[in-house]
Interface confidence: low
Amino acid sequence: DVERTTCPPEKEVHEIDESLIFYKKRELEACVDAALLAAQMDRVDAIPFTYEQLDVLKHKLDELYPQGYPESVIRHLGHLFLKMSPEDIRKWNVTSLETLKALLKVSKGHEMSAQVATLIDRVVVGRGQLDKDTVDTLTAFCPGCLCSLSPERLSSVPPSVIGAVRPQDLDTCGPRQLDVLYPKARLAFQNMSGSEYFVKIRPFLGGAPTEDVKALSQQNVSMDLATFMKLRREAVLPLTVAEVQKLLGPHVEGLKVEEQHSPVRDWILKQRQDDLDTLGLGLQGGIPNGYLILDLSVREALS
Protein backbone atom coordinates (compact mmCIF):
# COMPACT_ATOMS: atom_id res chain seq x y z
CA ASP A 1 0.00 0.00 0.00
CA VAL A 2 1.09 3.55 -0.71
CA GLU A 3 1.89 5.57 2.39
CA ARG A 4 0.01 8.85 2.79
CA THR A 5 2.03 12.07 2.79
CA THR A 6 1.28 15.73 2.28
CA CYS A 7 1.91 17.12 -1.17
CA PRO A 8 4.75 19.66 -1.30
CA PRO A 9 3.40 22.95 -2.77
CA GLU A 10 5.84 22.86 -5.69
CA LYS A 11 4.61 19.38 -6.63
CA GLU A 12 0.89 20.21 -6.80
CA VAL A 13 -0.70 18.68 -9.89
CA HIS A 14 -3.04 20.83 -11.96
CA GLU A 15 -2.89 18.78 -15.14
CA ILE A 16 -2.20 15.14 -15.96
CA ASP A 17 0.95 15.59 -18.03
CA GLU A 18 4.46 14.31 -18.62
CA SER A 19 5.84 15.83 -15.43
CA LEU A 20 4.19 13.00 -13.51
CA ILE A 21 6.68 10.43 -14.79
CA PHE A 22 9.25 12.09 -12.51
CA TYR A 23 7.02 11.73 -9.41
CA LYS A 24 7.77 9.06 -6.86
CA LYS A 25 4.91 6.76 -5.83
CA ARG A 26 4.18 8.63 -2.63
CA GLU A 27 4.24 11.97 -4.46
CA LEU A 28 1.70 10.69 -6.96
CA GLU A 29 -0.46 9.44 -4.13
CA ALA A 30 -0.28 12.73 -2.28
CA CYS A 31 -0.43 15.14 -5.21
CA VAL A 32 -2.76 13.68 -7.84
CA ASP A 33 -6.41 14.45 -7.25
CA ALA A 34 -8.52 11.42 -8.21
CA ALA A 35 -11.25 13.56 -9.77
CA LEU A 36 -8.67 15.36 -11.93
CA LEU A 37 -7.25 11.99 -12.97
CA ALA A 38 -10.71 10.72 -13.91
CA ALA A 39 -11.42 13.87 -15.92
CA GLN A 40 -8.13 13.62 -17.83
CA MET A 41 -7.84 9.86 -18.26
CA ASP A 42 -7.36 10.30 -22.00
CA ARG A 43 -3.91 11.79 -21.31
CA VAL A 44 -2.56 8.89 -19.29
CA ASP A 45 -1.75 6.73 -22.30
CA ALA A 46 0.67 9.23 -23.84
CA ILE A 47 2.80 9.21 -20.69
CA PRO A 48 5.31 6.36 -20.13
CA PHE A 49 4.34 5.50 -16.56
CA THR A 50 5.97 2.54 -14.86
CA TYR A 51 3.89 -0.35 -13.53
CA GLU A 52 4.43 1.01 -10.01
CA GLN A 53 3.10 4.43 -10.98
CA LEU A 54 0.09 2.85 -12.69
CA ASP A 55 -0.62 1.00 -9.42
CA VAL A 56 -0.92 4.36 -7.67
CA LEU A 57 -3.22 5.77 -10.36
CA LYS A 58 -5.43 2.70 -10.14
CA HIS A 59 -5.55 3.03 -6.38
CA LYS A 60 -6.73 6.63 -6.85
CA LEU A 61 -9.56 5.57 -9.15
CA ASP A 62 -10.54 2.69 -6.86
CA GLU A 63 -10.93 5.12 -3.96
CA LEU A 64 -12.98 7.52 -6.07
CA TYR A 65 -15.22 4.81 -7.54
CA PRO A 66 -15.52 1.96 -5.02
CA GLN A 67 -18.67 0.67 -6.78
CA GLY A 68 -16.92 0.49 -10.15
CA TYR A 69 -15.67 3.04 -12.68
CA PRO A 70 -18.06 4.96 -14.91
CA GLU A 71 -17.84 4.23 -18.63
CA SER A 72 -16.37 7.69 -19.31
CA VAL A 73 -13.31 6.59 -17.32
CA ILE A 74 -13.27 2.99 -18.58
CA ARG A 75 -13.20 4.16 -22.20
CA HIS A 76 -9.94 6.02 -21.61
CA LEU A 77 -8.17 3.56 -19.30
CA GLY A 78 -5.67 2.66 -22.00
CA HIS A 79 -2.79 0.71 -20.51
CA LEU A 80 -4.16 1.17 -17.02
CA PHE A 81 -6.53 -1.63 -18.10
CA LEU A 82 -3.55 -3.98 -17.72
CA LYS A 83 -3.78 -3.37 -13.99
CA MET A 84 -7.42 -4.42 -13.70
CA SER A 85 -8.46 -7.74 -12.21
CA PRO A 86 -11.60 -9.68 -13.20
CA GLU A 87 -13.04 -8.61 -9.83
CA ASP A 88 -12.54 -4.94 -10.76
CA ILE A 89 -14.12 -5.43 -14.16
CA ARG A 90 -17.15 -7.25 -12.74
CA LYS A 91 -18.21 -3.95 -11.14
CA TRP A 92 -18.38 -2.16 -14.49
CA ASN A 93 -21.35 -1.43 -16.69
CA VAL A 94 -20.13 -1.18 -20.29
CA THR A 95 -22.41 -0.55 -23.26
CA SER A 96 -20.15 1.16 -25.81
CA LEU A 97 -18.39 -0.94 -28.41
CA GLU A 98 -15.80 1.84 -28.77
CA THR A 99 -14.87 1.17 -25.15
CA LEU A 100 -14.65 -2.56 -25.87
CA LYS A 101 -12.47 -1.99 -28.97
CA ALA A 102 -10.11 0.33 -27.11
CA LEU A 103 -9.54 -2.14 -24.28
CA LEU A 104 -9.23 -5.17 -26.56
CA LYS A 105 -6.47 -3.36 -28.45
CA VAL A 106 -4.68 -2.62 -25.19
CA SER A 107 -4.89 -6.22 -24.00
CA LYS A 108 -3.31 -7.61 -27.18
CA GLY A 109 -0.01 -9.33 -26.46
CA HIS A 110 -0.67 -9.48 -22.70
CA GLU A 111 -1.89 -12.49 -20.72
CA MET A 112 -5.33 -11.11 -19.93
CA SER A 113 -7.76 -13.82 -20.99
CA ALA A 114 -9.67 -13.72 -17.69
CA GLN A 115 -9.96 -9.93 -17.77
CA VAL A 116 -11.01 -9.90 -21.43
CA ALA A 117 -13.61 -12.62 -20.80
CA THR A 118 -15.05 -10.62 -17.92
CA LEU A 119 -15.05 -7.42 -19.97
CA ILE A 120 -16.91 -9.09 -22.84
CA ASP A 121 -19.37 -10.52 -20.35
CA ARG A 122 -20.01 -7.02 -18.97
CA VAL A 123 -20.58 -5.68 -22.49
CA VAL A 124 -23.11 -8.41 -23.26
CA VAL A 125 -24.90 -7.72 -19.99
CA GLY A 126 -24.76 -3.97 -20.58
CA ARG A 127 -26.14 -4.21 -24.12
CA GLY A 128 -28.79 -6.77 -23.17
CA GLN A 129 -27.79 -9.34 -25.79
CA LEU A 130 -24.94 -10.49 -27.97
CA ASP A 131 -26.00 -8.47 -31.03
CA LYS A 132 -24.41 -8.37 -34.48
CA ASP A 133 -22.34 -5.24 -33.77
CA THR A 134 -20.84 -6.86 -30.69
CA VAL A 135 -20.06 -10.09 -32.55
CA ASP A 136 -18.51 -8.09 -35.41
CA THR A 137 -16.34 -6.22 -32.91
CA LEU A 138 -15.22 -9.43 -31.23
CA THR A 139 -14.39 -11.19 -34.48
CA ALA A 140 -12.45 -8.16 -35.73
CA PHE A 141 -10.52 -7.26 -32.60
CA CYS A 142 -10.37 -10.48 -30.60
CA PRO A 143 -10.60 -13.70 -32.64
CA GLY A 144 -11.49 -16.54 -30.30
CA CYS A 145 -12.95 -14.25 -27.65
CA LEU A 146 -16.48 -15.34 -28.46
CA CYS A 147 -15.64 -18.63 -26.80
CA SER A 148 -14.72 -16.87 -23.57
CA LEU A 149 -18.44 -16.27 -22.98
CA SER A 150 -20.44 -18.65 -20.86
CA PRO A 151 -23.12 -20.82 -22.50
CA GLU A 152 -25.69 -18.68 -20.67
CA ARG A 153 -24.38 -15.50 -22.33
CA LEU A 154 -24.10 -17.21 -25.72
CA SER A 155 -27.76 -18.15 -25.47
CA SER A 156 -28.56 -14.46 -26.06
CA VAL A 157 -27.13 -14.61 -29.60
CA PRO A 158 -29.96 -14.23 -32.13
CA PRO A 159 -29.67 -16.79 -34.99
CA SER A 160 -29.51 -13.88 -37.46
CA VAL A 161 -26.08 -12.95 -36.06
CA ILE A 162 -24.52 -16.40 -36.51
CA GLY A 163 -23.55 -15.63 -40.11
CA ALA A 164 -21.02 -13.08 -38.84
CA VAL A 165 -19.12 -15.76 -36.92
CA ARG A 166 -16.04 -17.15 -38.70
CA PRO A 167 -14.62 -20.66 -38.22
CA GLN A 168 -11.53 -19.36 -36.40
CA ASP A 169 -13.77 -17.57 -33.89
CA LEU A 170 -14.97 -20.97 -32.67
CA ASP A 171 -11.58 -22.68 -32.36
CA THR A 172 -11.49 -22.40 -28.59
CA CYS A 173 -15.18 -23.10 -27.95
CA GLY A 174 -15.93 -26.05 -25.68
CA PRO A 175 -18.74 -28.61 -26.09
CA ARG A 176 -21.17 -26.72 -23.83
CA GLN A 177 -20.75 -23.54 -25.85
CA LEU A 178 -21.18 -25.36 -29.15
CA ASP A 179 -24.27 -27.06 -27.73
CA VAL A 180 -25.78 -23.58 -27.45
CA LEU A 181 -24.52 -22.23 -30.77
CA TYR A 182 -25.24 -25.23 -32.98
CA PRO A 183 -29.07 -25.05 -32.92
CA LYS A 184 -28.84 -21.32 -33.69
CA ALA A 185 -26.53 -22.00 -36.63
CA ARG A 186 -28.83 -24.78 -37.89
CA LEU A 187 -31.70 -22.31 -37.86
CA ALA A 188 -29.64 -19.54 -39.46
CA PHE A 189 -28.45 -21.69 -42.37
CA GLN A 190 -31.53 -23.88 -42.86
CA ASN A 191 -32.46 -22.40 -46.25
CA MET A 192 -29.07 -23.07 -47.84
CA SER A 193 -28.35 -25.83 -50.35
CA GLY A 194 -26.57 -29.02 -49.18
CA SER A 195 -22.93 -28.19 -49.94
CA GLU A 196 -23.24 -24.53 -48.95
CA TYR A 197 -25.04 -25.54 -45.75
CA PHE A 198 -22.25 -27.94 -44.79
CA VAL A 199 -19.54 -25.31 -45.31
CA LYS A 200 -21.43 -22.92 -43.03
CA ILE A 201 -22.49 -25.40 -40.34
CA ARG A 202 -19.15 -27.25 -40.15
CA PRO A 203 -17.50 -25.03 -37.46
CA PHE A 204 -20.56 -25.52 -35.23
CA LEU A 205 -20.83 -29.30 -35.57
CA GLY A 206 -19.19 -29.90 -32.20
CA GLY A 207 -22.67 -29.23 -30.82
CA ALA A 208 -24.60 -31.45 -33.25
CA PRO A 209 -26.73 -34.40 -32.01
CA THR A 210 -26.50 -37.91 -33.51
CA GLU A 211 -29.55 -37.55 -35.73
CA ASP A 212 -28.07 -34.46 -37.46
CA VAL A 213 -24.73 -36.22 -38.00
CA LYS A 214 -26.61 -39.22 -39.45
CA ALA A 215 -28.51 -36.86 -41.76
CA LEU A 216 -25.23 -35.35 -42.98
CA SER A 217 -23.93 -38.81 -43.81
CA GLN A 218 -26.68 -39.06 -46.42
CA GLN A 219 -25.60 -35.87 -48.18
CA ASN A 220 -22.16 -36.74 -49.63
CA VAL A 221 -20.46 -34.00 -47.62
CA SER A 222 -17.03 -35.69 -47.29
CA MET A 223 -16.40 -34.43 -43.78
CA ASP A 224 -12.73 -33.84 -43.00
CA LEU A 225 -11.13 -35.72 -40.11
CA ALA A 226 -10.51 -32.56 -38.06
CA THR A 227 -14.23 -31.80 -38.02
CA PHE A 228 -15.09 -35.44 -37.27
CA MET A 229 -12.70 -35.46 -34.31
CA LYS A 230 -14.48 -32.42 -32.86
CA LEU A 231 -17.90 -34.09 -32.91
CA ARG A 232 -19.40 -34.93 -29.56
CA ARG A 233 -18.50 -38.44 -28.43
CA GLU A 234 -22.19 -39.09 -27.74
CA ALA A 235 -23.05 -38.08 -31.33
CA VAL A 236 -20.43 -40.39 -32.88
CA LEU A 237 -20.93 -43.61 -30.86
CA PRO A 238 -24.33 -44.58 -32.34
CA LEU A 239 -23.14 -44.20 -35.96
CA THR A 240 -22.79 -47.39 -37.98
CA VAL A 241 -19.67 -48.20 -39.98
CA ALA A 242 -21.61 -47.56 -43.19
CA GLU A 243 -22.74 -44.14 -41.94
CA VAL A 244 -19.21 -43.13 -40.97
CA GLN A 245 -17.92 -44.30 -44.34
CA LYS A 246 -20.52 -42.20 -46.16
CA LEU A 247 -19.96 -39.23 -43.85
CA LEU A 248 -16.19 -39.13 -44.35
CA GLY A 249 -16.09 -40.24 -47.99
CA PRO A 250 -12.45 -40.23 -49.16
CA HIS A 251 -11.35 -39.00 -45.73
CA VAL A 252 -12.31 -42.32 -44.14
CA GLU A 253 -8.67 -43.46 -44.38
CA GLY A 254 -7.87 -40.91 -41.69
CA LEU A 255 -9.59 -43.15 -39.12
CA LYS A 256 -6.46 -45.32 -39.09
CA VAL A 257 -4.32 -42.38 -37.99
CA GLU A 258 -6.80 -41.48 -35.24
CA GLU A 259 -7.70 -44.99 -34.08
CA GLN A 260 -6.14 -44.48 -30.65
CA HIS A 261 -7.89 -41.15 -30.03
CA SER A 262 -11.39 -40.27 -28.85
CA PRO A 263 -14.00 -40.30 -30.31
CA VAL A 264 -12.62 -42.74 -32.96
CA ARG A 265 -11.27 -45.18 -30.33
CA ASP A 266 -14.57 -45.22 -28.43
CA TRP A 267 -16.52 -45.68 -31.68
CA ILE A 268 -14.30 -48.61 -32.79
CA LEU A 269 -14.94 -50.40 -29.48
CA LYS A 270 -18.69 -50.34 -30.21
CA GLN A 271 -18.52 -51.69 -33.78
CA ARG A 272 -18.49 -55.31 -34.93
CA GLN A 273 -15.00 -56.26 -36.06
CA ASP A 274 -16.29 -57.71 -39.33
CA ASP A 275 -18.02 -54.37 -40.10
CA LEU A 276 -14.75 -52.53 -39.40
CA ASP A 277 -12.92 -54.96 -41.66
CA THR A 278 -15.10 -53.84 -44.58
CA LEU A 279 -13.28 -50.48 -44.48
CA GLY A 280 -10.02 -52.24 -45.31
CA LEU A 281 -8.06 -49.99 -42.95
CA GLY A 282 -6.92 -52.65 -40.47
CA LEU A 283 -8.83 -51.03 -37.60
CA GLN A 284 -8.62 -53.30 -34.52
CA GLY A 285 -10.57 -53.46 -31.29
CA GLY A 286 -14.11 -54.05 -32.50
CA ILE A 287 -16.48 -56.62 -31.02
CA PRO A 288 -15.37 -60.09 -32.15
CA ASN A 289 -17.66 -61.99 -34.52
CA GLY A 290 -20.27 -64.17 -32.76
CA TYR A 291 -20.42 -62.03 -29.62
CA LEU A 292 -23.85 -60.90 -28.37
CA ILE A 293 -24.08 -57.15 -27.69
CA LEU A 294 -26.02 -56.27 -24.52
CA ASP A 295 -26.90 -52.65 -24.00
CA LEU A 296 -26.49 -52.55 -20.23
CA SER A 297 -27.41 -48.90 -20.05
CA VAL A 298 -30.96 -49.76 -21.17
CA ARG A 299 -31.23 -52.63 -18.63
CA GLU A 300 -30.01 -50.33 -15.84
CA ALA A 301 -32.55 -47.72 -16.80
CA LEU A 302 -35.38 -50.29 -16.52
CA SER A 303 -34.30 -51.75 -13.17
Partner: antibody, heavy 117, light 113 residues
Protein backbone atom coordinates in the same frame (compact mmCIF):
# COMPACT_ATOMS: atom_id res chain seq x y z
CA UNK B 1 -4.47 27.44 -34.55
CA UNK B 2 -1.38 26.86 -32.41
CA UNK B 3 1.21 29.63 -32.80
CA UNK B 4 4.58 30.14 -31.14
CA UNK B 5 6.15 33.56 -31.69
CA UNK B 6 9.79 33.96 -30.68
CA UNK B 7 11.84 37.05 -29.93
CA UNK B 8 14.27 38.47 -32.50
CA UNK B 9 17.89 37.64 -33.25
CA UNK B 10 20.55 38.54 -30.68
CA UNK B 11 24.28 39.20 -30.85
CA UNK B 12 26.12 38.67 -27.57
CA UNK B 13 29.68 38.83 -26.29
CA UNK B 14 31.31 35.76 -24.71
CA UNK B 15 30.50 35.56 -20.98
CA UNK B 16 27.19 37.43 -21.39
CA UNK B 17 23.67 36.03 -20.98
CA UNK B 18 20.77 35.86 -23.41
CA UNK B 19 17.05 35.52 -22.68
CA UNK B 20 14.85 34.23 -25.50
CA UNK B 21 11.06 34.50 -25.28
CA UNK B 22 8.33 32.35 -26.83
CA UNK B 23 4.73 33.63 -26.80
CA UNK B 24 2.11 30.93 -27.23
CA UNK B 25 -1.44 31.27 -28.55
CA UNK B 26 -4.20 29.06 -29.95
CA UNK B 27 -4.24 26.59 -27.06
CA UNK B 28 -4.33 26.43 -23.25
CA UNK B 29 -0.78 27.40 -22.32
CA UNK B 30 -0.73 25.54 -19.00
CA UNK B 31 -1.83 22.23 -20.52
CA UNK B 32 1.34 21.42 -22.44
CA UNK B 33 5.06 21.26 -21.79
CA UNK B 34 7.30 23.76 -23.54
CA UNK B 35 10.62 22.38 -24.77
CA UNK B 36 13.72 24.25 -25.89
CA UNK B 37 15.90 22.82 -28.65
CA UNK B 38 18.93 24.39 -30.28
CA UNK B 39 20.65 23.93 -33.62
CA UNK B 40 24.18 25.15 -34.30
CA UNK B 41 24.86 26.31 -37.89
CA UNK B 42 24.83 23.31 -40.24
CA UNK B 43 24.44 20.93 -37.29
CA UNK B 44 21.74 18.70 -35.84
CA UNK B 45 19.17 19.29 -33.09
CA UNK B 46 19.98 19.30 -29.38
CA UNK B 47 17.33 19.15 -26.64
CA UNK B 48 18.06 21.64 -23.87
CA UNK B 49 15.20 20.98 -21.48
CA UNK B 50 11.51 21.50 -20.88
CA UNK B 51 9.18 23.28 -18.50
CA UNK B 52 5.68 22.53 -17.28
CA UNK B 53 3.93 25.93 -17.54
CA UNK B 54 1.28 24.84 -15.05
CA UNK B 55 3.62 24.06 -12.14
CA UNK B 56 6.87 25.66 -13.25
CA UNK B 57 8.65 22.29 -12.93
CA UNK B 58 11.53 22.09 -15.37
CA UNK B 59 13.96 19.41 -16.47
CA UNK B 60 17.29 20.36 -18.04
CA UNK B 61 19.77 18.49 -20.15
CA UNK B 62 22.79 18.04 -17.85
CA UNK B 63 24.99 19.62 -20.51
CA UNK B 64 23.31 22.95 -19.79
CA UNK B 65 22.31 22.42 -16.16
CA UNK B 66 24.55 25.07 -14.64
CA UNK B 67 23.86 27.71 -17.31
CA UNK B 68 20.22 27.44 -18.35
CA UNK B 69 17.06 28.71 -16.67
CA UNK B 70 13.58 28.14 -18.05
CA UNK B 71 10.65 30.15 -16.77
CA UNK B 72 7.10 31.00 -17.78
CA UNK B 73 4.73 33.92 -17.37
CA UNK B 74 1.27 32.37 -17.27
CA UNK B 75 -0.45 35.77 -17.49
CA UNK B 76 1.01 36.37 -20.96
CA UNK B 77 1.36 32.72 -22.02
CA UNK B 78 5.07 33.26 -22.58
CA UNK B 79 7.96 30.88 -21.98
CA UNK B 80 11.53 32.08 -21.48
CA UNK B 81 14.90 30.41 -21.82
CA UNK B 82 17.94 32.16 -20.38
CA UNK B 83 21.45 30.91 -21.14
CA UNK B 84 24.37 32.43 -19.24
CA UNK B 85 28.17 32.40 -19.57
CA UNK B 86 27.87 32.35 -23.32
CA UNK B 87 30.72 31.05 -25.46
CA UNK B 88 31.20 30.98 -29.22
CA UNK B 89 29.95 27.39 -29.48
CA UNK B 90 26.55 28.57 -28.16
CA UNK B 91 25.99 30.31 -31.50
CA UNK B 92 22.83 28.58 -32.73
CA UNK B 93 19.17 28.90 -33.59
CA UNK B 94 17.13 28.36 -30.42
CA UNK B 95 13.66 26.87 -30.89
CA UNK B 96 10.77 26.63 -28.47
CA UNK B 97 8.49 23.68 -29.17
CA UNK B 98 5.20 22.67 -27.61
CA UNK B 99 4.80 19.04 -26.64
CA UNK B 100 2.09 16.77 -27.88
CA UNK B 101 2.88 14.05 -25.36
CA UNK B 102 6.68 14.13 -24.99
CA UNK B 103 7.15 14.50 -28.75
CA UNK B 104 7.44 18.04 -30.15
CA UNK B 105 4.21 18.77 -31.97
CA UNK B 106 4.58 22.50 -32.74
CA UNK B 107 7.78 24.49 -33.23
CA UNK B 108 8.48 28.18 -33.06
CA UNK B 109 10.32 29.89 -35.96
CA UNK B 110 13.58 29.97 -34.00
CA UNK B 111 15.78 32.74 -32.64
CA UNK B 112 19.34 33.12 -33.90
CA UNK B 113 21.80 33.88 -31.10
CA UNK B 114 25.28 34.83 -32.25
CA UNK B 115 28.11 34.85 -29.72
CA UNK B 116 31.06 36.86 -30.98
CA UNK B 117 33.69 39.09 -29.52
CA UNK C 1 22.03 9.30 -22.28
CA UNK C 2 20.35 7.38 -25.07
CA UNK C 3 22.40 7.74 -28.26
CA UNK C 4 20.50 7.92 -31.55
CA UNK C 5 22.36 6.90 -34.72
CA UNK C 6 20.89 7.64 -38.13
CA UNK C 7 21.90 6.20 -41.49
CA UNK C 8 22.65 7.11 -44.14
CA UNK C 9 23.90 10.68 -43.64
CA UNK C 10 22.50 11.61 -47.05
CA UNK C 11 20.33 9.96 -49.65
CA UNK C 12 19.65 10.80 -53.32
CA UNK C 13 16.44 9.28 -54.68
CA UNK C 14 14.62 9.71 -57.99
CA UNK C 15 11.18 11.33 -57.97
CA UNK C 16 8.48 8.74 -57.35
CA UNK C 17 10.97 6.26 -55.86
CA UNK C 18 11.11 4.96 -52.30
CA UNK C 19 13.37 6.55 -49.69
CA UNK C 20 14.31 4.66 -46.53
CA UNK C 21 16.01 6.17 -43.49
CA UNK C 22 17.20 4.12 -40.54
CA UNK C 23 17.54 5.07 -36.90
CA UNK C 24 19.12 2.99 -34.15
CA UNK C 25 18.95 3.72 -30.42
CA UNK C 26 21.52 2.63 -27.84
CA UNK C 27 18.73 1.43 -25.52
CA UNK C 28 15.25 0.06 -26.15
CA UNK C 29 12.54 2.67 -26.66
CA UNK C 30 9.79 0.13 -26.08
CA UNK C 31 7.80 0.79 -22.91
CA UNK C 32 6.84 -2.58 -21.48
CA UNK C 33 3.70 -1.18 -19.90
CA UNK C 34 2.13 0.57 -22.87
CA UNK C 35 3.88 -1.42 -25.62
CA UNK C 36 4.55 1.96 -27.26
CA UNK C 37 7.89 2.81 -28.86
CA UNK C 38 8.77 6.34 -27.83
CA UNK C 39 10.34 7.50 -31.08
CA UNK C 40 9.43 10.50 -33.26
CA UNK C 41 10.46 11.59 -36.75
CA UNK C 42 10.79 15.23 -37.85
CA UNK C 43 11.26 16.91 -41.23
CA UNK C 44 13.27 20.11 -41.55
CA UNK C 45 13.20 21.90 -44.88
CA UNK C 46 15.95 24.44 -45.69
CA UNK C 47 15.51 27.65 -43.67
CA UNK C 48 12.51 26.30 -41.74
CA UNK C 49 11.73 24.91 -38.29
CA UNK C 50 11.44 21.16 -37.87
CA UNK C 51 7.98 19.66 -38.38
CA UNK C 52 6.62 16.57 -36.61
CA UNK C 53 5.85 13.67 -38.97
CA UNK C 54 5.56 10.54 -36.81
CA UNK C 55 5.38 9.73 -33.10
CA UNK C 56 5.15 6.44 -31.18
CA UNK C 57 7.37 5.12 -34.03
CA UNK C 58 4.47 4.60 -36.44
CA UNK C 59 1.64 7.03 -35.65
CA UNK C 60 1.38 9.64 -38.38
CA UNK C 61 0.72 13.20 -37.19
CA UNK C 62 -2.54 14.59 -38.60
CA UNK C 63 -2.06 16.33 -41.92
CA UNK C 64 1.08 14.36 -42.81
CA UNK C 65 0.75 12.66 -46.24
CA UNK C 66 0.36 8.89 -46.09
CA UNK C 67 3.46 8.37 -48.23
CA UNK C 68 5.35 8.88 -44.95
CA UNK C 69 5.34 5.83 -42.70
CA UNK C 70 7.29 4.76 -39.64
CA UNK C 71 8.08 1.25 -38.50
CA UNK C 72 10.30 -0.67 -36.12
CA UNK C 73 10.42 -1.54 -32.45
CA UNK C 74 12.88 -1.68 -29.58
CA UNK C 75 16.11 -0.23 -30.92
CA UNK C 76 15.71 -0.30 -34.72
CA UNK C 77 13.42 2.07 -36.57
CA UNK C 78 12.74 3.13 -40.14
CA UNK C 79 11.13 6.11 -41.83
CA UNK C 80 9.91 5.35 -45.34
CA UNK C 81 8.80 7.81 -48.01
CA UNK C 82 7.00 5.51 -50.42
CA UNK C 83 7.06 7.82 -53.44
CA UNK C 84 9.42 10.78 -53.15
CA UNK C 85 8.01 14.18 -54.16
CA UNK C 86 9.99 17.35 -54.87
CA UNK C 87 8.63 18.95 -51.69
CA UNK C 88 10.11 16.11 -49.58
CA UNK C 89 13.66 17.44 -50.05
CA UNK C 90 14.72 18.08 -46.43
CA UNK C 91 16.75 16.80 -43.50
CA UNK C 92 14.97 14.13 -41.45
CA UNK C 93 15.65 13.58 -37.75
CA UNK C 94 14.63 10.80 -35.40
CA UNK C 95 14.21 11.60 -31.70
CA UNK C 96 13.68 9.41 -28.67
CA UNK C 97 11.03 10.75 -26.32
CA UNK C 98 11.42 7.93 -23.82
CA UNK C 99 14.00 9.24 -21.32
CA UNK C 100 15.39 12.68 -20.55
CA UNK C 101 17.50 14.09 -21.97
CA UNK C 102 15.49 13.55 -25.15
CA UNK C 103 18.04 13.02 -27.90
CA UNK C 104 18.02 13.34 -31.68
CA UNK C 105 19.76 11.42 -34.43
CA UNK C 106 22.32 13.29 -36.50
CA UNK C 107 19.91 13.75 -39.39
CA UNK C 108 19.61 12.35 -42.93
CA UNK C 109 19.62 14.72 -45.90
CA UNK C 110 17.23 13.59 -48.66
CA UNK C 111 17.81 14.98 -52.14
CA UNK C 112 16.49 14.35 -55.67
CA UNK C 113 18.67 12.19 -57.89
Amino acid sequence: EVQLVQSGAEVKKPGASVKVSCKASGYTFTNYWMHWVRQAPGQGLEWMGNINPSSGDSYYNERFMSRVTMTVDKSTSTAYMELSSLRSEDTAVYYCARSGGLWLAFWGPGTLVTVSS
Amino acid sequence: DIVMTQSPDSLAVSLGERATINCKSSQTLLNSVSQNNYLAWYQQKPGQSPKLLIYFASTRESGVPDRFSGSGSGTDFTLTISSLQAEDVAVYYCQQHYRTPYTFGGGTKVEIK
